[in-house]
């Protein structure tokens, strides 16, 4: 057993033209965090395949807001080490994947938005217990500087953390302070004992009696934060020389709090407030099991049967995140079809459908022929998955619900006057023409070319008074029809509005629930 440790020194635009000015999008401020993934062997594995050796997520870095006209600074990074514990032997050869993620803090519907900014993959050989290895990697226009190492946790020792070093009660041939290591009884090994007083948070040692400082800390016991930074060279976290170190304004700067714990300064020290499921001086101990209820919003916890095992959360609809803590705007997936309005009520999605559509997702078109949606005697004509209405005389529109003006097309020929009527239209023909549409000329001798057709009306015709009477009746009928239509429409609208108010009231109640 042991721990793989990764220290991110810097992440920012690489040298050269075309380097990005800011990691944030135009939508506003953002902050960075890192994910490390370890896979055994040197094979080029897909980033999506399991991180068989383990994975870790850093805390969120400070909020970064781009300053207009200002040069792109070093980006503020999350504090502290990323630690990936491994339970079995350290494989020696491994793939290291480091992802830089951006969390946008603008006005996102449903909370912050995450996007992958850069991913670097390295295939490496590394012995456990060795010094920090340093690296610079490019990912597109970005540059990442980091150091890493693998160390065993007692009683495991050795380059693969496979040998167990146990104190023995029997006298041994080892010298003072040394102890025999199984399986070789005559092999003695001392875990490195750091210099007395060496900071547990900011220092470490590879040889007994030394105290080597992490990035941002200096002094014989690594207690002194470095106050200035002029450059960032390739020195690793074991560097104790001045320069090329990240500034550290206080005891919380090195982020001694692991697992997303928040650090607060106390006189001469710090205090960690740990998130749910973590405890210890630096929130380094996870005692979470499913019985602790680590999944928020009713999420289902799987695993965690024993205190050492991890758990995963299976989230309810509308939530995501490792602990189901992040709300998803399910309406962003546009589940409502045919222009329906989406409402995320938290415990359910509701689609408010446009007129003519129904169903949980407004997927049913009420205006199909099966619904006989053609009004006023219209005939439904289907074809190619769509439908249309062939309307009766005097009606139009998609569903034949609109009154059509039969005179709009000017059906009366030769200057005939058109009058609309419930049963259709009537043409009053100009002198010299006759027929239903005034389409036939009358012969000069007064004999029609088509004697079977009823003659049109001419001035001085004895039937003229009768026609005028008909026209007056038609006009009165039209006015009466319009009045009836307006009244019935108002009644319908009042009924619809009443139903809509009731529906909105119900939705308001559900949203409040």
């Amino acid at each position: 057993a042991g721990v793989f440790e990764l220290q991110i020194h810097s992440f920012g635009p690489g040298p050269g033209p075309g380097a990005p000015r800011s990691p944030c999008s135009a939508r506003g401020p953002c902050r960075l965090f890192f994910r490390v993934c370890l896979k055994p062997g040197l094979s080029e594995e897909a980033a999506e395949s399991p991180c068989a050796l383990g994975a870790a997520l850093s805390a969120r870095g400070p909020v970064y807001t781009e300053q207009p006209e200002a040069p792109a600074p070093d980006l503020p990074l999350p504090n502290g080490l990323l630690q990936v514990p491994f339970r079995d032997a350290w494989p020696g050869t491994f793939s290291l994947i480091i992802e830089t993620w951006r969390e946008e803090l603008g006005d996102q519907i449903g909370g912050p938005a995450w996007s992958l900014l850069a991913r670097v993959t390295r295939r490496r050989r590394l012995a456990a217990g060795g010094p920090w290895a340093r690296d610079i990697q490019r990912a597109g226009a970005w540059e990442l500087r980091f150091s890493y190492r693998a160390r065993c946790e007692l009683p495991a020792v050795g380059t693969a953390c496979t040998r167990l070093c146990r104190p023995r009660s029997a006298p041994s041939r080892c010298g003072p302070g040394l102890r025999p290591c199984a399986p070789l009884e005559d092999e003695c090994e001392a875990p490195p004992v750091c210099r007395a007083g060496c900071s547990l948070e900011h220092g470490f040692c590879e040889q007994p009696g030394e105290c080597r400082c992490l990035e941002g800390w200096t002094g014989p016991l690594c207690m002194v934060p470095v106050s200035t930074s002029s450059c960032l060279g390739l020195r690793g976290p074991s560097s104790t020389t001045t320069g090329c170190l990240v500034p550290g304004p206080g005891p919380c700067d090195g982020n001694p709090c692991a697992n997303g714990g928040s650090c607060s300064e106390t006189p001469g020290s710090f205090e960690c407030t740990c998130p749910r499921g973590f405890y210890g001086l630096r929130c380094e101990v996870s005692g979470v099991t499913c019985a602790d209820g680590p999944c928020f919003n009713g999420g289902l916890c799987v695993g965690g049967a024993d205190p050492d095992s991890a758990y995963i959360c299976h989230c309810p609809p509308g939530f995501q995140g490792s602990n189901c803590e992040k709300r998803v705007d399910r309406c962003s997936l546009q589940p409502c079809r045919n222009g329906g309005l989406c409402l995320d009520l938290g415990h359910a999605l509701r689609c408010r459908c446009r007129a003519g559509f129904a169903g949980p997702r407004c997927e049913h078109d009420l205006d199909d022929c099966a619904g006989r949606a053609c009004a006023n005697g219209g005939t439904c004509v289907e074809g190619g998955g769509a439908h249309r209405c062939s309307c009766a005389l005097g009606f139009g529109g998609r569903n034949c619900r609109e009154r059509a003006d039969p005179c709009a097309a000017r059906p009366c020929a030769h200057g005939g006057r058109c009058y609309a009527h419930f049963s259709g239209l009537v043409c009053a023909c100009a002198p010299g023409y006759m027929g239903a549409r005034c389409e036939f000329p009358v012969h000069p001798d007064g004999v029609s070319a088509l004697p079977a057709a009823p003659p049109g009306l001419r001035p001085g015709d004895p039937q003229r008074a009768g026609v005028i009477a008909v026209i007056v009746v038609v006009v009165i009928a039209i006015v009466a029809g319009i009045v009836v239509l307006v009244i019935s429409r108002k009644k319908r609208m009042a009924k619809y509005e009443k139903a809509e108010i009731k529906e909105m009231g119900e939705m308001h109640r559900e949203l409040n629930a």
């Epitope: 019985a291 602790d292 209820g293 009713g298 999420g299 289902l300 309810p316 609809p317 415990h347 949980p360």
Partner: antibody, heavy 117, light 107 residues
């Protein structure tokens, strides 16, 4: 070991009231949504209602069939959730289970409620 | 509310045989379906969540599949302790609803 133990069931006349309790052990009770699910004799399962956490202002939700008659409450300090049943009907006769979470992962052994004249 | 229809109502099989239980939803529920087992006189027990994931401690002979409206619970080789009533439940839309159950009995 996680345990949910229901109690308070019994025989009651139509229109009467009953209060069921569910005592939890082996879990950090205050972190769990709690539900009541019932099962009528020789019938399937029916969700009755749910109470969420203190951080959710102890929000409650109920099935339409019991809305206005049943009330769920919880006492985190006692690791207990309650179901207050008023205006009971014969169709409320069932075994009542308490369960946890959105997905009903842990279940109690149930308590029988019989509504009969 | 979403309606779940389970079939068959009863399945008569012998130990060692394969059991296939069906659950159909009245509308799309994604993969938000769970399966529960209930033995006589006992409370239900969660077997499968998310349509195809075995819950903690559930033997590998139980498997779930499906998405949308059609779901299946398969018991690859029936053990004597598997004879019970199985319910599917949907958790896509609130309130959660259950199917009427399938009784797996010894032939």
């Amino acid at each position: 070991e996680v345990q949910l133990v229901e109690s308070g069931g019994g025989l009651v006349k139509p229109g009467g009231s009953l209060r069921l309790s569910c005592a939890a052990s082996g879990i950090t009770f205050s972190n769990f949504w709690m539900n009541w699910v019932r099962q009528a004799p020789e019938k399937g399962l029916e969700w009755v209602g749910q109470i969420r956490l203190k951080s959710d202002d102890y929000a409650t939700h109920y099935a339409e069939s019991v809305k206005g008659r049943f009330t769920i409450s919880r006492e985190d300090s006692k690791n207990t959730v309650y179901l207050q049943m008023n205006s009971l009907k014969t169709e409320d006769t069932a075994v009542y289970y308490c369960t946890t979470g959105y997905y009903f992962d842990y279940w109690g052994q149930g308590t029988t409620v019989t509504v009969s004249s | 509310n979403i309606v779940l229809t389970q079939s068959p109502a009863t399945l008569s099989l012998s130990p060692g045989e394969r059991a296939t239980l069906s659950c159909k939803a009245s509308e799309n529920v994604g993969t938000y379906v769970s399966w529960f087992q209930q033995k006589p006189g006992q409370s239900p027990r969660l077997l499968i969540y998310g349509a195809s994931n075995r819950y903690t401690g559930i033997p590998a002979r139980f498997s779930g599949s499906g998405s949308g409206t059609d779901f299946t619970l398969t018991i690859s080789s029936l053990e004597p302790e598997d004879f019970a009533v199985y319910y599917c439940g949907q958790f896509y839309s609130f309130p959660s609803t259950f199917g009427g159950g399938t009784k797996v009995e010894i032939k």
